[in-house]
């Protein structure tokens, strides 16, 4: 049975040209994390694999940095970066856990961080 929960940074906003950290945290399970995929809609941004390390998709290499931890840092944000982001935790023996983050990139300097929330 899958007992874990994913905590994410939830709904967040950031300024155009700035950077943002996407963070997820898997808790309430002893399952071993074998790989974390970071995806934007249907595009793979990056993977962090326990046996291989980080792989950043070539189209995002200039604007995506690994970390902190299993998180992902998006840099040089544009309005086109607005949208849903998913952290997909591949674990053994539980299986897959998915967390969702919604990022809004604002033209103005009014960018407030949303509260944390949990996805079971």
């Amino acid at each position: 049975m899958m007992t874990g929960t994913i905590e994410t940074t939830g709904n967040i906003s950031a300024e155009k040209g700035g950077s943002i950290i996407l963070q997820c945290h898997l808790s309430s399970t002893t399952a071993q994390v074998t790989q974390v995929n970071w995806e934007q809609q249907d595009q793979l941004l990056a993977i962090c694999n326990a046996d291989l390390g980080w792989h950043i998709s070539p189209s995002f290499k200039d604007r995506v940095a690994p970390g902190p931890g299993l998180g992902l840092t998006l840099q040089s944000l544009t309005v086109n970066d607005t949208g849903e982001y998913f952290c997909i935790y591949h674990t053994y023996p539980d299986g897959t856990y998915t967390g969702r983050i919604f990022l809004e990139v604002l033209e103005s300097s009014v960018a407030e961080h949303g509260a944390r929330f949990q996805i079971p």
């Epitope: 694999n49 326990a50 046996d51 291989l52 390390g53 980080w54 792989h55 950043i56 690994p66």
Partner: antibody
Framework: EVQLVESGGGVVQPGRSLRLSCAAS????????MHWVRQAPGKGLEWVAV????????LYADSVKGRFTISRDNSKNTLYLQMNSLRAEDTALYYC????????????WGQGTMVTVSS | DIQLTQSPSSVSASVGDRVTITCRAS??????LAWYQQKPGKAPKLLIY???SLQSGVPSRFSGSGSGTDFTLTISSLQPEDFATYYC?????????FGGGTKVEIK
Amino acid sequence: EVQLVESGGGVVQPGRSLRLSCAASGFTFGSYYMHWVRQAPGKGLEWVAVIWPDGSNKLYADSVKGRFTISRDNSKNTLYLQMNSLRAEDTALYYCAKPVPKSRALDVWGQGTMVTVSS
Amino acid sequence: DIQLTQSPSSVSASVGDRVTITCRASQGISSWLAWYQQKPGKAPKLLIYGASSLQSGVPSRFSGSGSGTDFTLTISSLQPEDFATYYCQQAFYLPWTFGGGTKVEIK
């Protein structure tokens, strides 16, 4: 004894293809990520490709992407490297290698198979 | 991709000498660094992984240290069988990359 034995190397003309094989024994082949690493004559080591234990994912060095394909047959304990559109700069000794789990380091290497691309 | 710069590219030493080889990464790689020894006509042999963990069966005269961008392989007392080429390898990012090698020669 844990062992990797490569085969399939040889002399080939530019633009042609070659398929390398790596026969594994002495360990549970299907549980491991497997890598190809090459070494040009008199040069250093270059990582080429990796394949997931179940073959579900593969990643390549930019220098071979779109030309080389890594694959595996876990029922035969064999790793493959299909090399297409070969270039002179692909001339090298090709090693398959097995990692120490979670260490991201390669502890078992084959003896290598030599690929020479020349007209 | 991460570049690894090894220095020196070659070193002449005598049996019993202490030899130090450095490896510098172009970006931080935490402790995801391995060291290999290669002799002519042979496959590389893993010495150190995780920057400082000694691989099983490797003599204790080999040691590794460092984290972030700067790493060191030390051979405390060089033995005749240690004359070889040594490579570092990073595994924080794919593609994994290797240093250019350091050849340890007999003085």
